[in-house]
Amino acid sequence: ESWEPCVEVVPNITYQCMELKFYKIPDNIPFSTKNLDLSFNPLRHLGSYSFLRFPELQVLDLSRCEIQTIEDGAYQSLSHLSTLILTGNPIQSLALGAFSGLSSLQKLVAVETNLASLENFPIGHLKTLKELNVAHNLIQSFKLPEYFSNLTNLEHLDLSSNKIQNIYCKDLQVLHQMPLSNLSLDLSLNPINFIQPGAFKEIRLHKLTLRSNFDDLNVMKTCIQGLAGLEVHRLVLGEFRNERNLEEFDKSSLEGLCNLTIEEFRLTYLDCYLDNIIDLFNCLANVSSFSLVSVNIKRVEDFSYNFRWQHLELVNCKFEQFPTLELKSLKRLTFTANKGGNAFSEVDLPSLEFLDLSRNGLSFKGCCSQSDFGTTSLKYLDLSFNDVITMSSNFLGLEQLEHLDFQHSNLKQMSQFSVFLSLRNLIYLDISHTHTRVAFNGIFDGLLSLKVLKMAGNSFQENFLPDIFTDLKNLTFLDLSQCQLEQLSPTAFDTLNKLQVLNMSHNNFFSLDTFPYKCLPSLQVLDYSLNHIMTSNNQELQHFPSSLAFLNLTQNDFACTCEHQSFLQWIKDQRQLLVEAERMECATPSDKQGMPVLSLNITCQMNKT
């Protein structure tokens, strides 16, 4: 092909020419190309109009191309280019007009390019620039040059992993001249030891990230004091998992934050073994969103009812016990992948609408009632990937629920009463892999609005699917895979007029019957893969609903013998519906084992007597 040795990803649009030992820009790529990856080629030098042949380019990746010199107008023809990636090039000579002509550039990545200063970086004319990433360079001064006043669309400035030690008032002078309240600034992994008080006064940022910047607690405290007067929508403090300098916090560690205006706060990778956490977060009582990620905490019973947080996130933290959470204003709680507290204890969150308690290995002595969460406003509840959850209440006071996820938790007492009876607004329910054994036909009674039901990996009494879906008139998606099913009631799906996707894969069906699907006028996808289907269980196989577009019968045990000729012919007749038909193979007889069913030509003669 003309573009070889490059790889055509999307014809005429996207080409990958990575690591092909090119010394020059290839000339066999279509003019219409929009995305071009030339990374890991020893280009070394970019002369003027290097990309004249690609006027439509939107994304150009020149990572690690050993580029040392970029001449004036190297990208002159690329008026549509939105992303330019120069990561890992040891640039020594960058002409003043190196980036001229890039009138649409929105993202410039110059990570690890030996950049020593922003002052001489010739990007002042790139008015459309939204994201500038100059991380992992040799920049020592945080002075934002005057040309920044032209970059009125700038939203992300990544200066992480540079050599910035001091931040002075004059460094940020240009930000006073421009209304860049949308700017997100990442200064992580710079060895900062001084921020001049007033440097950030009256400056507005969307996000400021300071992670693994400080050698010790005192430096951190004084630097936080230096942020006084900053108005920031989101502040991220802390460290990285592999870059830990701070030993232990004391209660005054974050006192300086009282002099900032913060909307959302996140603390990452710190050890916080304080007796009273409330002191630490006193200055953050009024933020709307509060997040702790990978923080070791001795006790969190001390979150005060007066904290005005609306969103609390506690992720991958370590607790001695499940925290006492009593927060008046909280609307969203994400408490996931935490360690320590093994048993859930009730929380008092009267405004709560969204609750994610997944992946904590928690046991619940009872579930679920408004009294567990202290709210009647809950719409979203995720209790997936936990331990034993005993279903002992039918969601009293939680009738507003729309999304409920129990997957991979161990549900007890599921077949004793209609657990979900009051959940008339529930749209999504996942009880996959919950050790549920369906032995009660009323298990899903009351779920009148349900659209998605996932119950893979459970089991049924006598491996028989009874009429348990009678209330689910709005169901569009049903997953019954891996349920050890062998038989189903002919009327099991009769009320599911809106069902579009039905997954019956990975069960133990030995025959296929179209009869149960006759009342599914909306069915589009039926998956019967990974069963043991040999044949049909009645002579007259009817047609599937006309809406059906995809039928998956792969990895079954087709019996390719004369007695099943009509079934095999019927399968051939469904050819236009079949998914991955080439994976439908004969299992018996042995001489036909592994042969594709669709290529089989069975000629059977009747014995005349």
């Epitope: 019973e301 009812y305 006492t324 009593e326 009632s369 009294s371 567990d372 005993t390 002992s392 006071g397």
Partner: antibody, heavy 118, light 107 residues
Framework: QVQLQESGPGLVKPSDTLSLTCAVS?????????WHWIRQPPGKGLEWMGY???????DFNPSLKTRITISRDTSKNQFSLKLSSVTAVDTAVYYC???????????WGQGTLVTVSS | EIVLTQSPDFQSVTPKEKVTITCRAS??????LHWYQQKPDQSPKLLIK???HAISGVPSRFSGSGSGTDFTLTINSLEAEDAATYYC?????????FGGGTKVEIK
């Protein structure tokens, strides 16, 4: 509106077992919350005794753990207290109460006085 | 267990006067402290939850403050119907415990 009503004998002999029942109306005890017993000796302060959770789980004050049992009958919507081996110091007004999601008690029964005396 | 110490045990106050009752916890309990009012031959009635949050229906003259170990219940302008015993209760950890009570009498 949730209402709680204690009932049981007003006089119990020393070493016997004190038995009280709390009838609840306005909320099913198996539907949520935890249901508690609290007592108050004459002229003295309040002592929390223990509870039964809507799931059936129970927990007690360590000072009473060896003598106390709390059970329930969801069909009658009531829960019960048994306190064995009583002595004169167990003379008190016994209250049943519902605890909210926070550890406080907005709903109380009117209380019943139990005197331990021979 | 957490011990709550109330003071004073008894207070005799004239109507319209301001009443202050304190409750001290043996360890920090954040703001997990609640106040009850109990009139003779009645069951306790919840007044204030979480140190300072008034229960709906409770007159505005009742207010609470404090955090950590020291808490205060204030009745701003005492009325005759406020004659009762007032109890604090901690909800920080089990076993739940009550203060010894403060009896408020009208002079």
């Amino acid at each position: 509106q949730v209402q709680l009503q204690e009932s049981g004998p007003g006089l119990v002999k020393p070493s016997d077992t004190l038995s009280l029942t709390c009838a609840v109306s306005g909320y099913p005890i198996g539907g949520g919350y935890s249901w508690h017993w609290i007592r108050q000796p004459p002229g003295k302060g309040l002592e929390w005794m223990g509870y039964i959770h809507y799931s059936g789980y129970t927990d007690f004050n360590p000072s009473l753990k060896t003598r106390i049992t709390i059970s329930r009958d969801t069909s009658k919507n009531q829960f019960s207290l048994k306190l064995s081996s009583v002595t004169a110091v167990d003379t008190a007004v016994y209250y049943c109460a519902r605890k909210d999601s926070g550890n406080y008690f907005p709903y109380w029964g009117q209380g019943t006085l139990v005197t331990v005396s021979s | 267990e957490i011990v709550l110490t109330q003071s004073p045990d008894f207070q005799s106050v004239t109507p319209k006067e301001k009443v202050t009752i304190t409750c001290r916890a043996s360890q920090s309990i954040s703001d997990h402290l609640h106040w009850y009012q109990q009139k003779p031959d009645q069951s306790p009635k919840l007044l204030i939850k979480y140190a300072s949050h008034a229960i709906s229906g409770v007159p505005s003259r009742f207010s609470g403050s404090g955090s950590g170990t020291d808490f205060t219940l204030t009745i701003n302008s005492l009325e005759a119907e406020d004659a009762a015993t007032y109890y604090c209760q901690q909800g920080h950890s089990f076993p739940l415990t009550f203060g010894g009570g403060t009896k408020v009498e009208i002079k």
